[in-house]
């Protein structure tokens, strides 16, 4: 190995300059008494450098690049041998930036696979490899002292959320949560979040059905729907409210709202719809009066509202 | 602090019906959903029913279904458990219970035995 | 319906032994597990919470874990007021269902 190139850092802020000497030793002696030690940025070569012959005999050459514009380049130095170019040596340069702030952190629970799922947006990119960390610990009060700490949540590469399991969460207490990004510039860290997993909880919706139709049972009116829901079993014990969507099947009617509803209503006739009309359905729940995250819409129901009355019944709709 | 009373149990032969009550303080009533226990004598614990907070939801076990009728009422912050058709195997220790949001029994009242006999 | 069966029906141990009970679903119940003492002529207390969860005021010698179908109580260093019988519970959907029992006795 001929020669050997040092640089002042491999990786800088992106536009920042760098300096590097490449030194060639004395024992090279296939080469010239005084070779020209020529630079190169990729495959572009780069004018600038300073050489000089160092008191041990050995060649030094050393060069600024002013603004290093390039995320990732090798840098190398070499001589001219005979009609070609010979590289002594070759380093990676990366550029980038530090990582910014983690932001919009958010996390929610899910009883089904029992476990805190925590999602964050990472920032811009950094052009340089990035490693988030979810870190947690365990705490009595809101958060301002720390109990145990809880294993970091290592996400997998590219993702931007993590799952903490069950076994590391602490129910109806809080937790601080927060999470620190980290490369080879700096580290930052997300504004911490305090929370009780309890408090996140997102449950599963209800399941639509068609109202059976009982023999003593009135039918649905004109422009009514009757309709029941099944909960969702393991999350019936929490106190929940829920609202319903419909719109027509047909046309680009928008979805319409209907709420705040009781989980416990279970069923429900919904009216002032259009007669004879195809309708598609939906309902959500929401751990309710205690904090939580709403459900996502159930699977769609589709029903039909009945024909309007013979119109000589008509005026008993006004009463 | 939390507390459950249960009253209403005796003896009784069967056929014939019971009324037990369950008097809480010390939480919000209204809030919870609650349930009833019971323990045979010498046996292990078998869940009779529960109750949601508003009284909407009345799950039973299969083994007192249209027998025994759980209600409650809210402004006196009462639990109460209707037993009718009362048989020989229906005699136990019941437990009233306050339940958590994951379905665990969280407080317990100290019991009342009710025997079936002739 | 979801049958849980616990075992040991009962054991004996000395006091300071570790003590592990095991209580298994017929179907998943995903965390829905609930572990309960119970002493002669008193009522049960709840000792664990969703598969793991320490109910406040109880012993940090108990633990809890498992999910699914199977879940495991351990006593890490058994104490003269554990000796008492043990229930698990799963409140994963009715009818709710008690497991049979694991008596833990003095050697």
């Known amino acids: 190995e001929c020669g050997h190139i040092s640089v002042s850092a491999p990786i800088v802020h992106l536009g920042d300059p760098i300096t590097a000497s490449c030194i060639i030793k004395q024992n090279c002696s296939h080469l010239d008494p005084e070779p020209q030690i020529l630079w190169r940025l990729g495959a572009e070569l780069q004018p600038g450098g300073r050489q000089q012959r160092l008191s041990d005999g050995t060649q030094e050459s050393i060069i600024t690049l002013p603004h290093l514009n390039h995320t990732q380049a090798f840098l190398s130095c070499a001589l001219n041998w005979g009609n070609s170019l010979q590289i002594l040596d070759q380093v990676e340069l990366r550029a980038g930036y530090p990582p910014a702030i983690p932001h919009n952190l958010s996390c929610l629970m899910n009883l089904t696979t029992s476990s805190l799922i925590c999602q964050w947006e990472p920032g811009p990119e950094t052009h340089l490899p990035t490693s988030f960390t979810l870190k947690s610990f365990k705490s009595r009060g809101n958060c301002q002292t720390q109990g145990d700490s809880i294993l970091d949540c290592v996400p997998k590469d590219g993702q931007s959320h993590c799952s903490i399991p069950r076994k590391h969460l602490l129910l109806y207490q809080n937790m601080g949560i927060w999470v620190q990004a980290e490369n080879a510039l700096g580290t930052s860290m997300s504004p911490q979040l305090c929370l009780d997993p309890m408090d996140v909880v997102k449950l599963e919706p209800p399941m639509l059905r068609t109202m059976d139709p009982s023999p003593e049972a009135a039918p649905p009116q004109a422009g009514c729907l009757q309709l029941s829901w099944e909960p969702w079993q393991p999350g019936l014990h929490i106190n929940q409210k829920c609202e319903l969507r419909h719109k027509p099947q047909r046309g680009e009617a928008s979805w319409a709202l209907v709420g705040p509803l009781p989980l416990e209503a279970l069923q429900y006739e919904l009216c002032g719809l259009l007669p004879a009309t195809a309708y598609t359905l939906q309902i959500r729940c929401i751990r309710w009066p205690l904090p939580g995250h709403w459900s996502d819409w159930s699977p769609s129901l589709e029903l039909r509202t009945t024909e309007r009355a013979p119109t000589h019944h008509h005026h008993h709709h006004h009463h | 602090e939390v507390q459950l009373l249960e009253s209403g149990g005796g003896l009784v032969q069967p056929g014939g019906s019971l009324r037990l009550s369950c008097a809480a303080s010390?939480?919000?009533?209204?809030?919870?959903?609650m349930g009833w226990v019971r323990q045979a004598p010498g046996k292990g614990l078998e869940w009779v029913s529960s109750i949601s907070s508003s009284g909407g939801v009345t799950p039973y076990a299969d083994s007192v279904k249209g027998r025994f009728t759980i209600s409650r009422d809210n402004s006196k912050n009462t639990l109460y458990l209707q037993m009718n058709s009362l048989r020989a195997e229906d005699t136990a220790v019941y437990y009233c219970?306050?339940?958590?949001?994951?379905?665990?029994?969280?407080?317990w009242g100290q019991g009342t035995l009710v025997t079936v006999s002739s | 319906d979801i049958q849980m069966t616990q075992s040991p029906s009962s054991l004996s141990a000395s006091v300071g032994d570790r003590v592990t009970i095991t209580c298994r679903a017929s179907?998943?119940?995903?965390?829905?597990l609930n572990w309960y003492q119970q002493k002669p002529g008193k009522a049960p207390k709840l000792l664990i919470y969703?598969?793991?969860n320490l109910q406040n005021g109880v012993p940090s010698r108990f633990s809890g874990s498992g999910s699914g179908t199977d879940f495991t109580l351990t006593i890490s260093s058994l104490q003269p007021e554990d000796f008492a019988t043990y229930y698990c519970?799963?409140?994963?959907?009715?009818?709710?269902?008690f497991g049979g029992g694991t008596k833990v006795e003095i050697k």
């Open positions: 969703y598969a793991s």
């Open positions: 519970q799963q409140s994963f959907k009715y009818p709710m269902t």
């Open positions: 010390g939480f919000t009533f209204s809030l919870y959903w």
């Open positions: 179907q998943g119940i995903s965390s829905y």
């Open positions: 219970a306050k339940l958590g949001e994951l379905g665990q029994m969280v407080y």
